[in-house]
Amino acid sequence: MVPPPENVRMNSVNFKNILQWESPAFAKGNLTFTAQYLSYRIFQDKCMNTTLTECDFSSLSKYGDHTLRVRAEFADEHSDWVNITFCPVDDTIIGPPGMQVEVLADSLHMRFLAPKIENEYETWTMKNVYNSWTYNVQYWKNGTDEKFQITPQYDFEVLRNLEPWTTYCVQVRGFLPDRNKAGEWSEPVCEQTTHDETVPS
């Protein structure tokens, strides 16, 4: 009897949908695996007789509950199927946005870039998929614990009237208010402000 794949799960970030599993212990030799998806009531092969322990399902439609399954095989024997259900638009993890930061005197000027999507045109981003897409920004003085959060209305934001000659750190994430779903934070970007622009009288 061939044991089934273990720890079968979907790892999906920005609609890059990778079904992953672990190979079970099997004394007779090396196992191969076949992964399938349900399409119009028929299971279709996606990865056949692969020695890998993952299979890319990024070409699935973004909407709908998809049934995926994987089994282990050895010679002419095979395990039972292990099934999972996956809805990309609900289940995919929102990866960190890009961010460009520029210091202008005592201000930080930030521009945000929505994450790109696997199997899409360069310009079709997570912002196109989710109508309610917005950004959360948090910033803090480097070396302090107190963080401030803002929700920009656009793809850019300016933090004004900051302390001069002070290093501020900023990070951004995508947020979907209608789903109350937050994405992953970007890596912090830390920049030092320069002089105060105000001219003494």
Epitope: S59, L60, S61, K62, Y63, E120, N128, N131
Partner: nanobody, 124 residues
Framework: EVQLVESGGGLVQPGGSLRLSCAAS????????IGWFRQAPGKGLEGVSC????????HYADSVKGRFTISRDNSKNTVYLQMNSLRAEDTAVYYC?????????????????WGQGTQVTVSS
């Protein structure tokens, strides 16, 4: 049921232009995304371009960027694909498709309704 009808295909010399039309019955152009795809002989379906109803944004495959332009005329319920500087490798059957949810642009899996296609041949 939505019906999409493509027209405007034909034989054109390299460097020439064509304008494809995708006419829709009903209000299908209210759908969030309308896309153009093509299938060259012996090859799979390839995304070419799409237009989003929500913001009018247009999106293109790298292979056609700067040469093809997608647009829509809501009064005529029609989407157009203006194809300039055509090359032999643009030879294909071109299909338009409509998406109910508008979640995707390039992947055929994200579209719900399809036209029957129009042949474009680029040859001297």
């Amino acid at each position: 049921e939505v019906q999409l009808v493509e027209s405007g295909g034909g034989l054109v010399q390299p460097g020439g232009s064509l304008r494809l039309s995708c006419a829709a019955s009903g209000n299908s152009l209210d759908y969030p995304t309308i896309g153009w795809f093509r299938q060259a002989p012996g090859k799979g379906l390839e995304g070419v371009s799409c237009i989003s109803a929500s913001d009018g944004s247009t999106h293109y495959a790298d292979s056609v960027k700067g040469r093809f332009t997608i647009s829509r005329d809501n009064s005529k319920n029609t989407v157009y694909l203006q194809m300039n500087s055509l090359r032999a490798e643009d030879t294909a059957v071109y299909y338009c498709a409509a998406s109910l949810l508008g979640l995707g642009c390039k992947s055929e899996a994200d579209y719900d309704y399809w036209g029957q296609g129009t042949q474009v041949t680029v040859s001297s």
